[in-house]
């Protein structure tokens, strides 16, 4: 049976918590990704940003989970208007910001 949206969001949050807590060396070797506006369409925007990071096993599960939230196909190099123009941040900071935002969505009951 399909996983309820609240459960899926909680699992994504728990995966991001895992990443932040288990981080020893710089996450994804300090790779930089485009910063995004944490507004509507956050899942696709986050995936569009993180999909450009390759060879980083620490975020592969997150990429797969975000794929389940995003209704359209996302491929590397693609970017929506949610990108913060010309601003790149480290993956570790991106994950931390995304985590805070998703926990707030969970607390507010916004699962889709």
């Amino acid at each position: 049976s399909p996983v309820p949206p609240s459960t899926a969001l909680k699992e994504l949050i728990e995966e991001l918590v895992n990443i932040t807590q288990n981080q020893k060396a710089p996450l994804c070797n300090g790779s930089m990704v485009w910063s995004i506006n944490l507004t509507a369409g956050v899942y696709c925007a986050a995936l569009e940003s993180l999909i450009n990071v390759s060879g980083c096993s620490a975020i592969e599960k997150t990429q797969r989970m975000l794929n389940g939230f995003c209704p359209h196909k996302v491929s590397a190099g693609q970017f929506s208007s949610l990108r913060v123009r010309d601003t790149k941040i480290e993956v570790a900071q991106f994950v931390k910001d995304l985590l805070v935002h998703l926990k707030k969505l969970f607390r507010e009951g916004q699962f889709n």
Epitope: S6, K10, V100, K103, K104, R107, F111
Partner: antibody, heavy 120, light 112 residues
Framework: EVQLQQSGAELVKPGASVKLSCTGS????????IHWVKQRPEQGLEWIGR????????KYDPKFQGKATITADTSSNTAYLQLNSLTSEDTAVYYC?????????????WGQGTTLTVSS | DVLMTQTPLSLPVSLGDQASISCRSS???????????LEWYLQKPGQSPKLLIY???NRFSGVPDRFSGSGSGTDFTLKISRVEAEDLGVYYC?????????FGGGTKLEIK
């Protein structure tokens, strides 16, 4: 150490406005919610509303809509409560509190309170 | 709005006694994310409120195990197994599931 430091006591005339502040230290207010709570003399606690300083998403109890305005300035790590058209009913202690940072399940830290007295 | 009704208004006890405070909500306070955000706070004279119990039955760090919370749906209880002098003050239940969040009217625990 996490702390919420509120501005000092205010004595204000009826009809005037006042802006109370709540400054966080030891944490970033963008990472949580800041709530405001009212307590009239010898009375219980009333939730006024809360702000998500990361995006200025604000929720009020409808009974405080029009009376209270909650804002935040992330550069100074401070939340504000503005109260307008003051009457004796607004005489109270006003507390700010933050939601804990894991899942925002509860208020783990409170300010010391600001006493507002409305009197001519 | 969710009305939180606390009983009794005043609770005179002898030190060492058990105390029980009831809190009823006017509707279910199960959040859409599955959690029940029911908290108990203690306010001593001249002080800010302090958290005792969250999500119905979880004791906050540093809270003595003589405090326990229980209940579900619309009916909740705070119990103090052996009242100590430092427990005196006003106890408030609070629901953080539905906006506007609401407090109960308070229960004053005092010496008989």
């Amino acid at each position: 150490e996490v702390q919420l430091q509120q501005s000092g006591a205010e004595l204000v005339k009826p009809g005037a406005s006042v802006k109370l502040s709540c400054t966080g230290s030891g944490f970033n207010i963008k990472d949580t919610y800041i709530h405001w709570v009212k307590q009239r003399p010898e009375q219980g606690l009333e939730w006024i509303g809360r702000i998500d300083p990361a995006n200025d998403n604000i929720k009020y109890d409808p009974k405080f809509q029009g009376k209270a305005t909650i804002t935040a300035d992330t550069s100074s790590n401070t939340a504000y409560l503005q109260l307008n058209s003051l009457t004796s009913e607004d005489t109270a202690v006003y507390y700010c509190a933050r939601s804990e940072e894991n899942w925002y399940d509860f208020f783990d830290y409170w300010g010391q309170g600001t006493t507002l007295t409305v009197s001519s | 709005d969710v009305l939180m009704t606390q009983t009794p208004l005043s609770l005179p006890v002898s030190l060492g006694d058990q105390a029980s405070i009831s809190c009823r909500s006017s509707q279910s306070i199960v959040h859409s994310n599955g959690n029940t955000y029911l908290e108990w706070y203690l306010q001593k004279p001249g002080q800010s409120p302090k958290l005792l119990i969250y999500k119905v039955s979880n004791r906050f760090s540093g809270v003595p195990d003589r405090f326990s919370g229980s209940g579900s749906g619309t009916d909740f209880t705070l119990k103090i197994s052996r009242v100590e002098a430092e427990d005196l003050g006003v106890y408030y239940c609070f629901q953080g599931s539905h906006i506007p969040y609401t407090f109960g009217g308070g229960t004053k625990l005092e010496i008989k």
